[in-house]
Interface confidence: medium
């Protein structure tokens, strides 16, 4: 999906209002320096691409993030403020239902959510104004 035409400020407002708090809840008890951030993004569409990937694509050691509260709210924000996003996610959602796994908070998941926090921070305040 091409995130270029999303309403970035509306997504930012959704993040600051709710998603950020859910990420903090997920990470509670974890030191802010515990993980090295290896994922970065250069502009807002790129940040959303990386956020979508880390939030919804199962990875080795962390297959359960898509069912977390922050993920569901992220999905809702993208569906509302990114034209055509919902349609692109139907097949992906159906595939996810087939491989639903037991919800486990692993260290790998904590590391992934730490990366997400950095990506969201970058999305919210790109230094150079990006369209």
């Amino acid at each position: 999906y091409d995130f270029t035409n999303c309403d970035f400020e509306k997504i930012k407002a959704a993040y600051l209002s709710t998603i950020s708090k859910d990420l903090i809840t997920y990470m509670s008890g974890t030191k802010s320096t515990e993980f090295n951030n290896t994922v970065s993004c250069s502009n807002r569409p790129h940040c959303l691409t990386e956020i979508q990937s880390l939030t919804f694509n199962p990875t080795a050691g962390c297959a359960s993030l898509a069912k977390e509260m922050f993920a569901m709210k992220t999905k809702a924000a993208l569906a509302i403020w990114c034209p055509g996003y919902s349609e692109t996610q139907i097949n992906a959602t159906q595939a996810m239902k087939k491989r639903r796994k037991r919800k486990v908070t692993t260290n790998k998941c904590l590391e992934q959510v730490s990366q997400l926090q950095g990506l969201w921070r970058r999305f919210n305040r790109p230094l150079l104004k990006q369209q």
Partner: antibody, heavy 120, light 111 residues
């Protein structure tokens, strides 16, 4: 503990340059915008610019764009601000500051400040 | 650039009384219903300290006698009951539009 520790006071001649350092600890340096702010005697706060350590991207106040250079050393979690062609009106306390956790644009952690005196 | 104009430039208030500082922006600092205006307190020889973020949210460890209000272009910082340790210079700051700008500062003293 999250903190920013700046280098010591400097006395410089007009026309010379100064490089102020700001060492970060207690947080993931590469994912936070780092800013520099000037506070001249008897005046208000003035934003110089900012740098994103993740990729070195910078943004400057046009007033300082020609003379200020912001850099980072990710290996030591240190931000630098170099100011060239110094003049008397550059005499000020210079602060580095970390932008907040969420990208809301406020500064939640500040360095202790570095006094730069420009005098012949 | 967005110009922030604080009023008054200086203010003397009795201990226990209310202090009010205003900040007017030359254009709106709102985005999608959120106001990106922040307030700081600076004491002599110290760096600024965050008091209020996004117009009305109390910074970490800030006493609840401090409060902020406003939206669009007009914002207010209020200290409900002035304490001796509140003597300082107060600044508003916006980051809605680059470059980031501060108000000129308001010096608060005890009457």
């Amino acid at each position: 503990e999250v903190q920013l520790v700046q280098s010591g006071a400097e006395v410089k001649k007009p026309g010379s340059s100064v490089k102020v350092s700001c060492k970060a600890s207690g947080f993931t340096f590469s994912t936070y915008n780092m800013h520099w702010v000037k506070h001249a005697p008897g005046q208000g706060l003035e934003w110089i610019g900012a740098i994103y350590p993740g990729n070195g991207e910078t943004s400057y106040n046009q007033k300082f764009k020609d003379r200020a250079t912001l850099t980072v050393d990710k290996s030591t979690s240190t931000a630098y601000m170099e100011l060239s062609s110094l003049r008397s009106e550059d005499t000020a306390v210079y602060y580095c500051a970390r932008e907040d956790d969420y990208g809301e644009g406020y500064f939640d952690v500040w360095g202790q400040g570095t006094t730069v005196t420009v005098s012949s | 650039d967005i110009v922030l104009t604080q009023s008054p430039d200086s203010l003397a208030v009795s201990l226990g009384e209310r202090a009010t500082i205003n900040c007017r922006a030359s254009e709106s600092v709102d985005q999608s219903g959120l106001s990106f205006m922040h307030w700081y307190q600076q004491k002599p020889g110290q760096p600024p300290k965050l008091l209020i973020y996004r117009a009305s949210n109390l910074g970490s460890g800030v006493p609840d006698r401090f409060s902020g209000s406003g939206s669009g272009t007009d914002f207010t910082l209020t200290i409900s009951s002035l304490q001796a340790e509140d003597v300082a210079v107060y600044y508003c700051q916006q980051i809605n539009t680059d470059p980031l700008t501060f108000g000129q500062g308001t010096k608060l003293e005890i009457k």
